[in-house]
């Protein structure tokens, strides 16, 4: 079943390559288990950036060696992506799945355009 | 008389606070004197950033204390804005006026959203 997911249109990564945004879903029921996946779309290619699963009220557990961290609060997930470089500029899509209890719900946001600027190297200290 | 002006939707300033974009106008005739003005729109406030007048085939002349520089080539103006900081993020609108010979033409672009990220300060050298 479809579910609405909202996320900001544009976010700027910091000069340290860190970008944060909120992914909010309109939960149709009382889900106790939620799965969040961040997808990156660039040049019509979609790749998975990171994924997390959590019990509502608990911390997000990111899977594998993730470049993402996050916290949850109600129907909001606060996502932070680290280690970004200029070449990582692209559309970052938030996908939310309500896994338990049935019925299963799936929602996909319109994406957040993350802009990343590589910093100038600091001058060598003499 | 109205004239079409095209400019990119989004531009990222470099980590040095420099942003460049092209402003292109569809010249209905052979103008010899052109005036280009860059306006910044933020929070429904519109302010002038810089302005230049040039004779076609010649260099753009910005005022000495201007944060803008630029070159012209045919119906294109290559604009560079320097000294930008994060607080300068906003919509930069290109306004082109064909001043001479008559008739006078005016064109205003849809604006280029310039994003600026302040760099991290370099560590002090010991």
């Amino acid at each position: 079943k479809a579910m609405h997911v909202a996320q900001p249109a544009v976010v700027l990564a910091s000069s340290r390559g860190i970008a944060s945004f909120v992914c909010e879903y309109a939960s149709p029921g009382k889900a106790t288990e939620v799965r969040v996946t961040v997808l990156r779309q660039a040049d019509s290619q979609v790749t998975e950036v990171c994924a997390a699963t959590y019990m509502t009220g608990n911390e997000l557990t990111f899977l594998d060696d993730s470049i993402c961290t996050g916290t949850s609060s109600g129907n909001q997930v606060n996502l932070t992506i680290q280690g970004l470089r200029a070449m990582d500029t692209g559309l970052y899509i938030c996908k939310v799945e309500l896994m338990y209890p049935p019925p299963y719900y799936l929602g996909i946001g319109n994406g957040t355009q993350i802009y990343v600027i590589d910093p100038e190297p600091c001058p060598d200290s003499d | 008389k109205a004239m079409h002006v095209a400019q990119p939707a989004v531009v990222l300033a470099s980590s040095r606070g420099i942003a460049s974009f092209v402003c292109e106008y569809a010249s209905p005739g052979k103008a010899t004197e052109v005036r280009v003005t860059v306006l910044r729109q933020a929070d429904s406030q519109v302010t002038e950033v810089c302005a230049a007048t040039y004779m076609t085939g010649n260099e753009l002349t910005f005022l000495d204390d201007s944060i803008c520089t630029g070159t012209s080539s045919g119906n294109q103006v290559n604009l560079t804005i320097q000294g930008l900081r994060a607080m300068d993020t906003g919509l930069y609108i290109c306004k082109v006026e064909l001043m001479y010979p008559p008739p006078y033409y005016l064109g205003i672009g849809n604006g280029t959203q310039i994003y600026v990220i302040d760099p991290e300060p370099c560590p002090d050298s010991d």
Partner: antibody, heavy 123, light 107 residues
């Protein structure tokens, strides 16, 4: 011990419907999801859908939406699957299975299966 | 839908040998994978879940491994009762699809 007892084999005519049952014992019926599977030599094992007996919440595999209807009766600890408008493609062995842990992150598994019900669609 | 591929449809081995059965997912399933054994005319039995956790009562000669899209089931020192069909199943996004199965036969 945990047991899922499925109803007996069925021989049905094309166009008819059939209802399969799965009686659970040895655990609290409403504490676990009940899933249904289809197995054929051609398509192998396929997940049909799941029902939460506690809430009645259901998720179907899109492929079986409109074909299968899942229900559960808490009073008799029995799950049911009605299969509609049968064709020869629906001839298969159907299993009910229990998901092993109720809402435990990172613990998805079908830990107990019924013995299976063979359905043959033939005129 | 996520496609689960078991490239080896059948495999012959002798008692005492070690065999490895593989399963590939069409996208990252983050270890949300189970392995089942099925003997002729019987229902599937759980062997491994979470890609590498043995089910209750499953002999230690069975082991699961893998991550991302590539997973495998290893059986050390094959016993006569190990012959049958083996299926992988993912639990990432619904529908929770199965691999086509690998039939392990006695050589």
């Amino acid at each position: 011990q945990v047991k899922l007892q499925e109803s007996g084999a069925e021989l049905v005519r094309p166009g008819a419907s059939v209802t399969l049952s799965c009686k659970a014992s040895g655990y609290t019926f409403t504490d676990y999801e009940m899933h249904w599977m289809k197995q054929t030599p051609v398509h192998g094992l396929e997940w049909i859908g799941v029902i939460d007996p506690e809430t009645g919440g259901i998720t179907y595999n899109q492929k079986f939406k409109g074909k299968a209807t899942l229900t559960a009766d808490k009073s008799s600890s029995t799950a049911y699957m009605e299969f509609l408008s049968l064709t020869s493609e629906d001839s298969a062995v159907y299993y009910c299975t229990r998901r092993g842990a109720r809402a435990t992150v990172y613990n998805y598994v079908m830990d107990y299966w019924g013995q299976g019900t063979s359905v043959t669609v033939s005129s | 839908d996520i496609v689960m591929t078991q490239t080896t449809a059948s495999l012959s081995a002798s008692v005492g040998e070690t065999v490895t059965i593989t399963c590939r997912a069409s996208e990252n399933i983050h270890n949300y994978l189970a392995w089942y054994q099925q003997k002729q005319g019987r229902s599937p039995q759980l062997l491994v879940y979470n890609a590498k956790t043995l089910g209750d009562g499953v002999p230690s000669r069975f082991s699961g491994s893998g991550s991302g899209t590539q997973y495998s089931l290893k059986i050390n020192s094959l016993q006569p009762e190990d012959f049958g069909s083996y299926y992988c199943q993912h639990f990432w996004s619904t529908p929770w699809t199965f691999g086509g199965g690998t039939k392990l036969e006695i050589k």
